[in-house]
């Protein structure tokens, strides 16, 4: 039961952050204008991957697409490769979990593919989450970086004889979203991993199999076969024969040709 | 077409309140803000504030912060100022105004302060 | 506060002419957002609400006739009508709308000769 729990809860948490991350992609508030030196301003400027915005006195609001590729920034092209690539493995994991999940039973998926389709997502959520705390914190970086350096020439004047103040932008509502979305997406991804564990077979115990060789009726009942990891043992040529009545969680042997859902 | 419609004049004694009002049409009335401006012979144009219907936020000039409130209705798309402990010197001309660069004004309300 | 000075205070033309007319800000209203200067201007007949004609220092407004040219930045701002026309004949404003409070000009009269 708690390994379907933690299989559930991982998927869930996963998905939330997954569906985070995609907002935080789309969001246009990934950088701010700081107000700190004009708080009084009608124009209020913030930007996304994607686009930059301007809400003006009227309330309006006026949005412009980067519409190059070459003329931006490396490091934003850099952030939006990993938030693409973060949703990207996340939504392949999402898919992959779907089948994976213990309280689905699709055809006769034996329980170390489940396992193998566990720890598959898992991984991937957990790679999907590093990639958005990543971009987020490259994004962070740079803003942090200009910040000073904006700030270090913060006026730039006509013969210092007007006064204008240089935009500086500061974090915007995008980044804690990210920041958020990405750390439940690995959390998501760890507890698929916790739960892909007590989905392995850890143990197949062998019921008693004669093997009759010519000549000698000898009777070979072996001892409790440790599989190394449960997924990826080499399960050719082994003869395995289900026991009687289990439990959900427990460890399930291959179902037989005549088991079916 | 977007249209503001203003309430008609008032003649009000010193020291009491007015509440004119600006009934909106034409556009979707919380997705800009309201502003109003007095208008007087001697002091030309005052921005005085805006309301902002969609989230019910305000801003005033601090020339106006203790002498004007300023309201919405978005149920009747209406925005509302009132004016309190009225001088001489608040009998002016007043505008609401909306849309990109004030695109959209009212005919104005003209309020006369009596003794 | 930004300080919106406006010269001259009065322009006395013949219609037909070309008619220029300035206005200074005490403080930048250059958004360096979207490279837009944020500068308004009006035309106000008397008994009339003012009447937008120019916003973000130089875009027309819609139905406003192209003799009407806003040009400048940073500080100086420019309102020029080409071929003065006797329905031109009003007070001209400008305005901030860069900075809060927004502030207006004093205004510039064009009167007929």
């Known amino acids: 039961m708690a390994v379907t729990a933690c299989q559930g809860l991982g998927f869930v948490v996963s998905l939330i952050g997954i569906a985070g991350i995609i907002a935080a992609t789309c969001m246009d508030q990934w950088s701010t204008q700081d107000l700190y030196n004009n708080p009084v301003t009608a124009v209020f400027n913030y930007q996304g991957l994607w686009r930059s915005c301007v809400r003006e006195s009227s309330g309006f609001t006026e949005c412009r697409g980067y519409f190059t590729l070459l003329g931006l920034p490396a490091m934003l092209q850099a952030v939006r490769a990993l938030m693409i690539v973060g949703i990207v493995l996340g939504a392949i994991g999402l898919l992959v979990s779907i089948f994976a999940l213990k309280c689905i039973r699709i055809g006769s998926m034996e329980d170390s593919a489940k396992a193998n389709m566990t720890l598959t997502s898992g991984i991937m959520f957990i790679v999907s989450g590093l990639c958005a705390i990543a971009g987020v914190s490259v994004f962070a970086n740079m803003l942090v970086t200009n910040f000073w350096m904006s700030t270090a020439n913060m006026y730039t004047g006509m013969g210092g004889m007007v006064q204008t103040v240089q935009t500086r932008y500061t974090f915007g509502a995008a980044l804690f979203v990210g920041w958020v979305a990405g750390g439940l997406t690995l959390i998501g991804g760890v507890m698929m991993c916790i739960a892909c564990r007590g989905l392995a077979p850890e143990e197949t115990n062998y019921k008693a199999v004669s093997y009759h060789a010519s000549g000698h009726s000898v009777a070979y009942k072996p001892g409790g076969f440790k599989a190394s990891t449960g997924f990826g043992s080499n399960t050719k040529n082994k003869k395995i024969y289900d026991g009687g009545a289990r439990t959900e969680d427990e460890v399930q042997s291959y179902p037989s040709k005549h088991d079916y859902v | 077409q977007a249209y503001l419609q203003q309430s008609g004049a008032e003649l009000v004694r010193s020291g009491a309140s007015v509440k004119m009002s600006c009934k909106a049409s034409?556009?979707?009335?919380?997705?800009?803000?309201i502003h109003w401006v007095k208008q007087t012979p001697g002091q030309g144009l005052e921005w005085i504030g805006y309301i902002s219907p969609g989230n019910g936020g305000s801003n005033y000039n601090l020339n106006f912060k203790d002498k004007a409130t300023l309201t919405a209705a978005t149920s009747s798309t209406t925005a509302y100022m009132q004016i309190s402990s009225l001088t001489s010197e608040d009998s002016a001309v007043y505008f609401c105004?909306?849309?990109?660069?004030?695109?959209?004004w009212g005919q104005g309300t003209l309020v006369t302060v009596s003794a | 506060d930004i300080v919106m000075t406006q010269s001259p205070s009065s322009l006395t033309v013949t219609p037909g002419e070309k008619v220029t007319m300035s206005c200074r800000s005490s403080q930048s209203l250059f958004n360096s957002g979207n490279q837009k200067n944020y500068l308004i201007w009006y035309q106000q007949k008397p008994g009339q609400p003012p009447k937008l004609l120019i916003y973000?220092?130089?875009t027309r407004d819609s139905g406003v006739p192209d003799r009407f040219t806003g040009s400048g930045s940073g500080t100086d701002f420019t309102l020029t009508i080409s071929n003065v026309q006797a329905e031109d004949l009003a007070v001209y404003y400008c305005q901030n709308d860069y900075s809060y409070p927004l502030t207006f000009g004093a205004g510039t009269k064009l009167e007929l000769k």
């Open positions: 105004a909306t849309g990109r660069g004030f695109a959209y």
């Open positions: 034409g556009f979707t009335f919380t997705s800009y803000n």
């Open positions: 973000r220092a130089s």
